[in-house]
């Protein structure tokens, strides 16, 4: 029976050219973690292993850095980076584990302010 | 030990398809990447495509794609590459080699592909 | 896609000498993250599949004998083998795998003098 949780940073922005971290963290259970895997949209960002370590999906490697931890640090962000981001936990005995993010990027804060207050 | 055992030659017709395995054995089959390559009669190597059999993920040479597909049974530990359309160009020896993130570090034998009318 | 220049072509080299081969890379291999170049040697000889002898451009793979060293970082990568010996007579690639698709050099074929 699986009874962890994973919890994740739930919905997060970030400014366009700036860098985020995305984070999840399974709770709840004693299952051991073998693998985890990160996608953006069934892309293939990056693989932590226990026994091999960090893969980072060669189509990545100069916008994606590994950690801190088993999160995955996304740098020089666009606008086309916005979307959905997937944790997937691969665990002994209880299987799969997935939690979400969803990720918007946004322009610069004086254009991001620019848009929220309009001068009368 | 590790080891990548390829099935045997063929000779295929213009036109026609060929299926090669690559059959692991030694280690973690779905830990590593399998990746495919392509050497022509005295001529260089060629990276082909990889795929992960841990996972969906798959990765084309756009040399190659739409041409090329890769699969993967984990029940056997075995990575099929399909190559459709053949022509006299795809002749040659096709290797697959195992991979995670510091290189390729183990190869089949090679599988020779010929194609002739 | 990222192009692998190796140099020479072909290498004559008496046993015991000195053997260097070159490979250039057109963009940079350098893993910021890691600070490690992804690239890798690997020699072929006739009839055998390509055996790895060095990755992230200086480490040595396991059972590869200690003549054979990487070096190089970015974009420009040398093998050297300090002291050639009768079975070091192959072809030698140079991969880049930073980036899809991998890509090799044409290769260097080392012969004796």
């Known amino acids: 029976m699986m009874t962890g949780t994973i919890e994740t940073t739930g919905n997060i922005s970030a400014e366009k050219g700036g860098s985020i971290i995305l984070q999840c963290h399974l709770s709840s259970t004693t299952a051991q973690v073998t693998q985890v895997n990160w996608e953006q949209q069934d892309q293939l960002l990056a693989i932590c292993n226990a026994d091999l370590g960090w893969h980072i999906s060669p189509s990545f490697k100069d916008r994606v850095a590994p950690g801190p931890g088993l999160g995955l640090t996304l740098q020089s962000l666009t606008v086309n980076d916005t979307g959905e981001y997937f944790c997937i936990y691969h665990t002994y005995p209880d299987g799969t584990y997935t939690g979400r993010i969803f990720l918007e990027v946004l322009e610069s804060s004086v254009a991001e302010h620019g848009a929220r207050f309009q001068i009368p | 030990q590790v080891q990548l055992v390829q099935s045997g030659a063929e000779v295929k017709k213009p036109g026609a398809s060929v299926k090669v395995s690559c059959k692991a054995s030694g280690y973690t089959f779905t830990n590593y990447w399998i990746h495919w390559v392509k050497q022509a009669p005295g001529q260089g190597l060629e990276w082909i495509g990889d795929i992960y059999p841990g996972g969906r993920y798959s990765n084309y040479n756009e040399k190659f794609r739409g041409r090329v597909t890769l699969t993967a049974d984990t029940s056997t530990s075995t990575v099929y590459m399909e190559l459709s359309s053949l022509t006299s160009e795809d002749t040659a020896v096709y290797y697959c080699?195992?991979?995670?993130?510091?290189?390729?570090?183990?190869w089949g034998q090679g599988t020779t592909v010929t194609v002739s009318s | 896609d990222i192009v692998m220049t190796q140099s020479p072509d072909s290498l004559a080299v008496s046993l015991g000498e000195r053997a260097t081969i070159n490979c250039k890379s057109s963009?940079?291999?350098?893993?910021?993250?890691?600070?490690?170049?992804?690239l890798a040697w690997f020699q072929q000889k006739p009839g055998q599949p390509p055996k790895l002898l060095i990755y992230?451009?200086?480490t040595r793979e396991s059972g590869v004998p200690d003549r054979f060293s990487g070096s190089g970082s970015g974009t420009d990568f040398t093998l050297t083998i300090s002291s050639l010996q009768a079975e070091d007579l192959a072809v030698y690639y140079c991969?880049?795998?930073?980036?899809?698709?991998?890509?090799f050099g044409a290769g260097t074929k080392l012969e004796l003098k």
């Open positions: 080699a195992r991979y995670y993130e510091s290189a390729m570090d183990f």
């Open positions: 963009q940079n291999l350098l893993y910021n993250s890691n600070q490690k170049s992804y």
């Open positions: 992230w451009a200086s």
């Open positions: 991969q880049q795998y930073y980036n899809y698709p991998f890509t």
